[in-house]
């Protein structure tokens, strides 16, 4: 088993909050059985760890929030993988169990004598993890012990079900809303025939199910729907791409309810198979505006339209983060590993010196170089503040007129904390109101992004619209330089005058062949020709019949 997973970031405090971040990439298919995680991650990993540490510092120095109470944390690595996250969650639970036994005086040494050893404080709540599938597994465990969980990016619709996931809350909306936003985009450009891809796992599966249900109601046909694991090998992505190609040129739009790494896998397969520019990808917020998805594969990604949860950059986080250095940052146990990975160099003489890098890290290196803030940073911070405000409200009601932890609050009761959290209402880091509905969900506001070539070999994401409470606004001129550039994704063109649609058996309703009505027939409806009654003939526009004027023949008339 990999030792990197055993690493934990601690910050002392009167109350300890747990957190699960994907500090490393998920294990590759061949490493899943040994749960060996992949490379260290900056945005989804290190930045989130630092956000937790620094946000708690800010909360602790705020005299109006939890006065006389210090919040601490225990951060563990989920590796974006259920098995790893569950293992780490069990560690959280174990701490809690040992603590509660200790409270009751049950801690004994093997020889029967009493222990002077003081165990860790229990975890009162958990922030994260990022993935819906992983969050579901973690919630299944945490709720058994009444430990509230606040997610910052797990958006699966399933998590709204409070009968199943009672102790789960989130500062992000349910995916039902972004599925609606994606359908609205498809409708806007009259794409009636699209291919569909989703990441295997809860996020992709439930999101795509919603997208397909909504599409069907809007008369949008799915050419074919495919699923793939995010960590699938090249061969799986190649096969998927070939299948998508078989629906060209009709289904040029591919709706992808996918995690970012699934999109990257598709882009890489497009490069290998020579399919750049053949598809327009419509991506969910797993892609959003992430550069780690498109890096090195920009040509393949050009034109992509993505959904991004509305969350502006947090300036004060950058002010803190960009000053961090491996010589002085000792509280983040993954920081040295990250620094070496980020700059592809070796930190000579450091405890975590990595000999795989030949070059030595020089002292002029700075995180300012190519810095990109995690697109969900605002949500991570809001999730931490939600926990703090929930505890603050709980303290106010249980310990009136008392600064600090009163006896009524010790040990912290998860049921009461959940109640308090659900009532939380405060101004978030970006100035928006943070509140939770009866399902523990937050309202949905999305930005629509478009990945474009801005100049020679320079690519970027451009904000081209928004989706807010069911209303889609798009800057069409920004997406398509002229009307004729709008990509077509239709199975069959409309029939000409005097023709009807014939849908072949087993085909979707968007695919038809056009057949002309017979000489004496008119178009009754788009699928039916009807013969005119005796004495009448189809009108010029072939939409009905006119009586044939009676002409009486006279003896001397020439033959007609």
């Amino acid at each position: 088993q990999s030792s990197e997973r055993r690493v934990v970031a601690h910050m002392p405090g009167d109350i300890i909050i747990g957190a699960l971040f994907s500090v490393h990439h998920q294990p590759t298919v061949d490493k899943v059985h040994e749960r060996k995680c992949g490379a260290v991650r900056e945005q989804y990993g290190i930045q989130r760890v630092e956000a937790m540490l620094h946000t708690l510092e800010r909360i602790n120095s705020d005299p109006t929030l939890l006065p006389n109470i210090t919040l601490g944390c225990e951060i563990r690595d989920s590796c974006w993988h259920s098995a790893v996250a569950l293992e780490q969650s069990i560690e959280f639970i174990r701490d809690s169990l040992i603590s509660s036994e200790e409270e009751e005086g049950l801690v004994r040494c093997v020889d029967g004598s009493s222990s002077s050893f003081r165990s860790k404080k229990p975890i009162v709540g958990v922030i994260g993890p990022g993935s819906s599938s992983v969050a579901i597994q973690v919630q299944n465990l945490l709720q058994l012990f009444n430990i509230p969980q606040i997610a910052y990016s797990a958006t699966s619709m399933d998590l709204s079900d409070k009968t199943l996931f009672k102790y789960f809350m989130r500062v992000v909306p349910s995916d039902a809303q972004q599925a609606r936003a994606m359908v609205d985009i498809v409708k806007r450009y009259n794409w009636t025939y699209v291919s569909a891809v989703h990441t295997e796992g809860n996020y992709g599966e439930s999101g795509m199910e919603a997208f397909k249900d909504m599409s069907a109601k809007e008369g949008i046909c799915i050419a074919h729907s495919y699923k793939i694991y995010s960590n699938a090998g090249e061969q799986s992505f190649d096969k998927l791409l070939k299948k998508l190609t078989s629906h060209l040129p009709k289904a040029r739009v591919v709706a992808c309810f996918c995690e970012g790494m699934t999109v990257r896998g598709l882009l890489m397969a497009m490069r290998r198979l020579g399919l750049a520019g053949e598809f327009l990808l419509l991506g969910s917020d797993g892609w959003a505006d992430r550069y780690d998805v498109t890096d090195g594969y920009q040509r393949e990604a050009v034109g992509g339209i993505t959904i991004k949860l509305q969350s502006p950059d947090v300036k004060w986080f950058d002010d803190y983060y960009l000053k961090l250095r491996p010589e002085t940052n000792h509280r983040n146990p993954w920081f040295q590993e990250f620094w070496q990975h980020r700059f592809q160099c070796r930190l000579e003489g450091f405890p975590q010196e990595n000999s795989k890098y030949n070059k030595t890290c020089n002292s002029s290196l700075t995180l300012k170089t190519h810095h990109v803030q995690d697109s969900k940073m605002g949500f991570v911070i809001n999730a931490i503040y939600s926990m703090a405000y929930g505890l603050h409200n709980m303290q106010m009601s249980l310990c009136p007129g008392y600064a600090g932890l009163c006896d009524a609050m010790k040990p912290i009761d998860g049921r009461k904390l959940l109640e308090s959290l659900m009532k939380t209402n405060f101004t978030g880091v970006s100035g928006d109101t943070i509140l939770f509905d009866e399902n523990g969900d937050s309202p949905g506001r999305y930005e629509i992004m478009n990945f474009k070539e801005m100049g020679k070999d320079y690519f970027d994401y451009i904000n081209v619209g928004s989706w807010d409470n069911g209303e889609l606004k798009m800057d069409d001129d920004e997406v398509w330089s002229k009307k004729s550039n709008i990509i077509r994704s239709v199975c069959s063109e409309p029939c000409e005058k005097g023709q009807i649609k014939v849908i072949r058996k087993g085909e979707v309703s968007c695919c038809w062949t056009c057949t002309p009505c017979k000489e004496n027939e008119y178009v009754f409806d788009e699928y039916t020709c009807k013969a005119c009654q005796l004495g009448s003939w189809p009108t010029d526009d072939l939409t009905g019949c006119d009586l044939i004027p009676v002409q009486y023949l006279r003896w001397g008339d020439p033959e007609p």
Partner: antibody
Framework: SVEESGGRLVTPGTPLTLTCTVS????????MNWIRQAPGKGLEWIGI?????STYYASWAKGRFTASKTSTTVDLKMTSLTTEDTATYFC??????????????WGQGTLVTVSS | ALVMTQTPASVEVAVGGTVTIKCQAS??????CSWYQQKLGQPPKLLIY???KLASGVPSRFKGSGSGTQFTLTISGVECADAATYYC????????????FGGGTEVVVK
């Protein structure tokens, strides 16, 4: 059906355009390949033009060969011809609109002879 | 670059015999290998696609197998009409290749 035309005897350095005329299917729905065969030699792939108009060429053909299309024809422009380019040039329809797959429909070929 | 190496270059077989032609891809092309038959003065004709699928109208004595990097065309119960040159072709990618075809195998029927 597919039918190649434009093959003839040319002197080295002369540019030449071959045309592949198709009927019974739309060029939007299929990728078209150009393949050549020198006398007594094997098949040599030159390049492909997708239904969308995107093109890919064999590394040796890049810059000297250019494929383009209209609604019913696919052209292959050849420049800086040498005697090595003497061959029968085939046009073949791919199974799909993009990517390289397998060639289901072939023309009879048109002979290009480069000689001084 | 992706290269298709075909062996042997030439093979003699008696009527009723079996002939095996091999094709090796320089990288994994999954099952995207096709086989063609070309007779003198004619364009090639598709025999097998996607490694093992028989093209329409092709007799069942032609059999394709293999996946990844190793592919085989087997002709059993060889007939005089099978005298031709056979080519394999990768259907993986048109990007950065020199040729999508193998060098060809001439089958001489005695």
């Amino acid at each position: 059906s597919v039918e190649e035309s434009g093959g003839r005897l040319v002197t080295p350095g002369t540019p030449l355009t071959l045309t592949c005329t198709v009927s019974g299917f739309s060029l939007n729905n299929y990728a078209m390949n150009w393949i050549r065969q020198a006398p007594g030699k094997g098949l040599e792939w030159i390049g492909i033009i997708y239904g969308s108009g995107s093109t890919y060429y064999a590394s040796w053909a890049k810059g000297r060969f250019t494929a383009s299309k209209t609604s019913t024809t696919v052209d292959l422009k050849m420049t800086s011809l040498t005697t090595e380019d003497t061959a029968t040039y085939f046009c073949a329809r791919d199974e799909l609109a993009a990517g390289i797959n397998y060639f289901t429909l072939w023309g009879q070929g048109t002979l290009v002879t480069v000689s001084s | 670059a992706l290269v298709m190496t075909q062996t042997p270059a030439s093979v003699e077989v008696a009527v009723g015999g079996t002939v095996t032609i091999k094709c090796q891809a320089s990288q994994n092309i999954i099952d995207w290998c096709s086989w063609y038959q070309q007779k003198l003065g004619q364009p090639p004709k598709l025999l097998i696609y996607e490694a093992s699928k028989l093209a329409s109208g092709v007799p069942s004595r032609f059999k394709g197998s293999g996946s990844g990097t190793q592919f085989t065309l087997t002709i059993s119960g060889v007939e005089c009409a099978d005298a031709a040159t056979y080519y394999c072709q990768q259907g993986y990618s048109p990007s950065g290749v020199d040729n999508v075809f193998g060098g060809g195998t001439e089958v001489v029927v005695k």
